[in-house]
Interface confidence: medium
């Protein structure tokens, strides 16, 4: 499907609004430190150029690739060397190496200030004064903080952001209307970013075979009535979409995502009975809805898997003829029968089945050798089932904050070399699995919990890759994508770790503690908890609980005092001394 001008093709396909939004997202994800105005200027220049190509596809430079056009534009930024250091060296390279270079310099943890939410009236005024700029600013601020955010989905978030302001800035109580909507968008946005980051890590670190296996399992669960070839078609198309977005090809990605939504809606009968209400929606909503659609009902008459994959004498013949197809069909058949399993478990089962066939099809009596293969799955299935059961019991017993603290202690003991902010962020998010998944019925708990944990642990892997400090983390992150969670679960107290020297400054607090939000207070306390464990990795739960209870009492007391700062100055050293004694 060749076009004389790629930029004209995409401009016509996407329309001006989406084209400009996607180019802004692309530039903001590459040059994360550039000021907003600089990006808007670059986007306007690219858009004007695209329009000239639409008018005449033979015009000068219109035949250049999008990477060439966008890369040339990014390389015109005057302060590239001062702001980005060695990233400026990318501009000396030719395509495709230049784009690869830009991709490698994306920063998952950019040194950007947290977004502060202004007063509602201030936001509504800004929205009414210049709606277009207000929404561009949203795209820019999210994209630069989340350089792998799924771009077409970010356009959907921006549309919801716009709708929230359009509705709530007219409301009698603007804040009551707007703030819950913004909170929901923020939380959903963070979750969406983390999920997409795992998809990109899967493609970039483990290859498209790993991503395709994940997609076969997930789509087979969602669309159990679809036949294997149909699921495979969707997987092929979905892989192309995510490969493009993860590679920075955001215009192609958005265009292909729209094509995939169109295909699914035109072929609902052979895919799923659940697509109908998605397909009545406008494009951005439709694509989002299709991605989140609930699992269709399983066909009633599915035969036993054992007949084709264990009892048949042709198993090794079928495997030998086309290994990937046979394993793909096994994964499809297993997944469509098990919406109650996590995708990662299904992939482990497929791996175990493959390993058994590799061994048994070379044996003297293959059938005898693989006859018990399904029995070997039992421990693989029970491990995540037990993990979910135990952790949900703990969550119900402790509540979210204390459950997070239990995980903080657990993970700090496993990998104490990891930075405190990373341990706090990751453990807090691991702890959110309780509220998200434990309330669900039994059949939905494991897929919810384990697949969510995979997303959170990927964040740990991504942050750790930037600043590697622990061989154990590197090993769990790089050896096997599907076994990451079991690998982390299996880690014990790091006996080789030399405890961190006690630093009183780490445990010195001030009156500003009292004005923090509840979440910020929790983060402060949890930061102290991690530091305590790093100082005394062998401290018991009881000892740590005692210290944390004293800490909470000390903060509460000083925040009630008339002279708060004096109280912190006097009581702080007492708390530190008492804590050291308690942990001695």
């Amino acid at each position: 499907d060749t076009h004389k001008s790629e930029v004209a093709h995409r401009f016509k396909d996407l329309g001006e609004e989406h084209f400009k939004g996607l180019v802004l997202v692309a530039f903001s994800q590459y040059l994360q430190q550039c000021p907003f105005e600089e990006h808007v200027k670059l986007v306007n220049e690219v858009t004007e150029f695209a329009k000239t190509c639409v008018a005449d596809e033979s015009a000068e430079n219109c035949d250049k690739s999008l990477h060439t056009l966008f890369g040339d534009k990014l390389c015109t930024v005057a302060t590239l060397r001062e702001t980005y250091g060695e990233m400026a060296d990318c501009c000396a390279k030719q395509e495709p190496e230049r784009n690869e270079c830009f991709l490698q310099h994306k920063d998952d943890n950019p040194n950007l200030p947290p977004l502060v939410r202004p007063e509602v009236d201030v936001m509504c005024t800004a929205f009414h004064d210049n709606e277009a700029t207000f929404l561009k600013k949203y795209l820019y601020e999210v994209a630069r903080r989340h350089p792998y955010f799924y771009a077409p989905e970010l356009l959907f978030f921006a549309a919801r952001y716009k709708a929230a302001f359009a509705e709530c800035c007219q409301a009698a109580d603007k804040a009551a209307c707007l703030l819950p909507k913004l909170d929901e968008l923020r939380d959903e946005g963070k979750a969406s970013s983390a999920k997409q980051r795992l998809k990109c890590a899967s493609l970039q670190k483990f290859g498209d075979r790993a991503f395709k296996a994940w997609a076969v399992a997930r789509l087979s669960q969602k669309f159990p009535k679809a036949e294997f070839a149909e699921v495979s078609k969707l997987v092929t198309d979905l892989t192309k979409v995510h490969t493009e977005c993860c590679h920075g090809d955001l215009l192609e990605c958005a265009d292909d995502r729209a094509d995939l939504a169109k295909y699914m809606c035109e072929n609902q009968d052979s895919i799923s009975s659940k697509l109908k209400e998605c397909c009545d929606k406008p494009l951005l909503e439709k694509s989002h809805c299709l991605a989140e659609v609930e699992n269709d009902e399983m066909p009633a008459d599915l035969p036993s898997l054992a007949a084709d994959y264990v009892e048949s004498k042709d198993v090794c013949k079928n495997y030998a003829e086309a290994k990937d197809v046979f394993l793909g069909m096994f994964l499809y058949e297993y997944a469509r029968r098990h919406p109650d399993y996590s995708v990662m478990l299904l992939l482990r089962l497929a791996k175990a089945y493959e390993a058994t066939l590799e061994k048994c099809c070379a044996a003297a009596d293959p059938h005898e050798c693989y006859a018990k293969v399904f029995d070997e799955f039992q421990p693989l299935v029970e491990e995540p089932q037990n993990l979910v059961k135990q952790n949900c019991e703990l969550f119900e017993q402790l509540g979210e904050y204390k459950f997070q603290n239990a995980l903080l202690v657990r993970y700090t003991k496993k990998v104490p070399q990891v930075s405190t902010p990373t341990l706090v962020e990751v453990s807090r998010n691991l702890g959110k699995v309780g509220a998200k998944c434990c309330k669900l019925p039994e059949a939905k708990r494991m897929p919810c919990a384990e697949d969510y944990l995979s997303v959170v642990l990927n964040r740990l892997c991504v942050l750790h890759e930037k600043t590697p400090v622990s061989e154990k983390v590197t090993k769990c992150c790089t050896e096997s994508l599907v076994n990451r969670r079991p690998c982390f679960s299996a880690l014990e107290l790091d006996e080789a770790y030399v405890p961190k020297a006690f630093n009183a400054e780490t445990f010195t607090f001030h009156a500003d503690m009292c004005t923090l939000s509840e979440k910020e207070k929790q983060v402060k306390k949890q930061t102290a908890l991690v530091e305590l464990v790093k100082h005394k990795p062998k401290a018991t739960k009881e000892q740590l609980k005692g210290v944390m209870d004293n800490f909470a009492a000390f903060v509460e007391k000083c925040c009630k005092a008339d002279d708060k700062e004096a109280c912190f100055a006097e009581e702080g050293p007492k708390f530190v001394a008492a804590s050291q004694a308690a942990l001695a």
């Epitope: 294997f228 149909e230 495979s232 078609k233 092929t236 198309d237 295909y263 084709d308």
Partner: nanobody, 117 residues
Framework: EVQLLESGGGLVQPGGSLRLSCAAS????????MGWVRQAPGKGLEWVSL????????YYADSVKGRFTISRDNSKNTLYLQMNSLRAEDTAVYYC??????????WGQGTLVTVSS
Amino acid sequence: EVQLLESGGGLVQPGGSLRLSCAASGFTFNHYTMGWVRQAPGKGLEWVSLIHPSGTVIYYADSVKGRFTISRDNSKNTLYLQMNSLRAEDTAVYYCARWSSRAFDYWGQGTLVTVSS
């Protein structure tokens, strides 16, 4: 009634090429995954290739990957198999077949391909 009619078989030298065609009728061709299956003399059936209705998802047996190309023309209700770099072990009766859910449900009569010098 479903009908599948293969053509294009014949005698060819090793390293040569052939193109098989399969004319389909009696069903909505563009709704079905289609495939080719072969049976060598004295051997069991071996599936060769499958193609999704859209033409975009294609599978090949490992033994033919890189040499055979399956394609379809939905406007003509026709399935094709382009066979290049043919070997003696490709000698077989080639059947065009319709795929339904978990297996092939309708087959043609077959066309014989002989690879010999």
